[in-house]
């Protein structure tokens, strides 16, 4: 693994990265839990969403999102003008016109109502660190990802390789 | 240009360990996930190891977890597979292979080494 | 573990043949599908991967489509350099899983 210079090196050039396409590669309808197995939920409330972090009573429906898959060009660190590899980019949607948003100046995320062309602060960098669990690093604050705060959803800096597997920053996503 | 060189295959008796490695270069190695996988002599492809980007996870099938062990040295851009107590139905070309997309499993392997033949038997 | 049913084991094309291989998954998964050719005393190479999108440098004679259980490779128009080993794959689950494999062959 690699230390905090690494993490910076492999995020610094998120910023430069495109977007190849304006369609997705694929979509995939999920629900969306924590490490923990706490169901990611989506309310309205005064005509705007709500997002919590909770225990689901048993048989209770889990919500479902939406997410839709980009492939986004990522510039050589070495040339500067090859392309050194593909990320995978993600938008995430629990409902039409609604989509997750990072605001880090409030370190938070939101849902908004929004047209396409998306904004930037709706696209989050696709991470495996397990097998079977993912991470959603924010395209406009490399080294930020979603993470749950308090029952909430939030945005976490991480600023080492070792805090890439923190459990709070680690998502499950199934069809059930 | 993206280049994955194993080595280290050979003629080893059952029982015995070999240490497999492959050099990588032309990307980024520590963005990406690695991955092993085999072909017995005219058969099919077979999984065998994969290691997370940060090397924090390792996943094996039932068929060789316990005796392979797969790891990685980001500082030399190799990945490594360490085979123990050898068996004859371990005989195969093992290929190293990288994914697809930076710190990510999907989209299956389109950078594949020129493989290493191991032979396991007495 | 995904069980990933190959057809047909074997085929025989003449050139310029449209042929189709497919894919049956024991269960249902997301497109993460991939498909490879592979010829004789070399490496698997990419052709297909999310199941439909084609890898960079692959002729676009080659195409898959399919989701859930049912999977398709298609070559619209053999060539002589189609002749090979061709195989499937899921990355949705773990274990990961490979098809049995089809052998192309011209008539």
């Known amino acids: 693994a690699f230390g905090i210079s690494g993490v910076q090196k492999y995020t610094r050039a998120l910023h430069d990265s495109s977007i190849t396409g304006i369609s997705p590669i694929t979509e995939y309808l999920a629900s969306l839990s924590t490490y923990n197995d706490q169901s990611i939920t989506f309310a309205l409330e005064d005509e705007s969403y709500e997002i919590y972090v909770e225990d689901l009573k048993k048989d209770e429906k889990k919500d479902k999102v939406l997410l839709s898959y980009y492939e986004s060009q990522h510039p050589s660190n070495e040339s500067g003008d090859g392309v050194d590899g593909k990320m995978l980019m993600v938008t995430l949607s629990p409902t039409k016109d609604f989509w997750l948003h990072a605001n880090n100046k409030e370190h938070s995320v939101e849902l908004h109502k929004c047209e396409k062309p998306l904004p930037d602060q709706a696209f989050f960098v696709l991470h495996n660190m397990h097998s079977n669990c993912v991470s959603f690093e924010c395209k406009t604050d490399p080294g930020v990802f979603i993470g749950v705060k308090d029952n909430h959803l939030a945005l976490i800096k991480v600023d080492s390789s070792e805090n890439l597997c923190t459990e709070n920053i680690l998502f499950k996503l199934s069809e059930t | 240009e993206v280049q994955l060189v194993e080595s280290g295959g050979g003629l080893v008796q059952p029982g015995t360990s070999l240490k497999l490695s492959c050099l990588a270069s032309g990307f980024t190695f520590n963005n990406y996930w690695m991955t092993w996988i085999r072909q017995a002599p005219g058969k099919g492809l077979e999984w065998i190891a994969s290691?997370?980007?940060?090397?924090?996870?390792?996943y094996y099938p039932d068929s060789v977890k316990g005796r392979f062990t797969i790891s990685r040295d980001d500082a030399k851009s190799t990945l490594y597979l360490q085979m123990n107590s050898l068996r004859s139905e371990d005989t195969a070309t093992y290929y190293c292979?990288?994914?697809?997309?930076?710190?990510?499993?999907?989209?299956?392997?389109?950078?594949w080494g020129q493989g290493t033949l191991v032979t396991v038997s007495s | 573990d995904i069980q990933m049913t190959q057809s047909p084991a074997s085929l025989s094309a003449s050139l310029g043949e449209t042929v189709s291989i497919e894919c049956l998954a024991s269960e249902g998964f997301s497109n993460d599908l991939a498909w490879y050719q592979q010829k004789s005393g070399k490496s698997p190479q990419l052709l297909i991967y999310a199941a439909s999108r084609l890898q960079d440098g692959v002729p676009s004679r080659f195409s898959g489509s399919g989701s859930g259980t049912r999977f398709s490779l298609k070559i619209s128009g053999m060539q002589p350099e189609d002749e090979a080993d061709y195989f499937c794959q899921q990355g949705s689950k773990y274990p990961l899983t490979f098809g049995s494999g089809t052998k192309l062959e011209i008539k």
């Open positions: 290691i997370t980007y940060t090397g924090g996870g390792t």
């Open positions: 292979t990288r994914a697809n997309y930076y710190y990510n499993t999907y989209g299956g392997f389109p950078y």
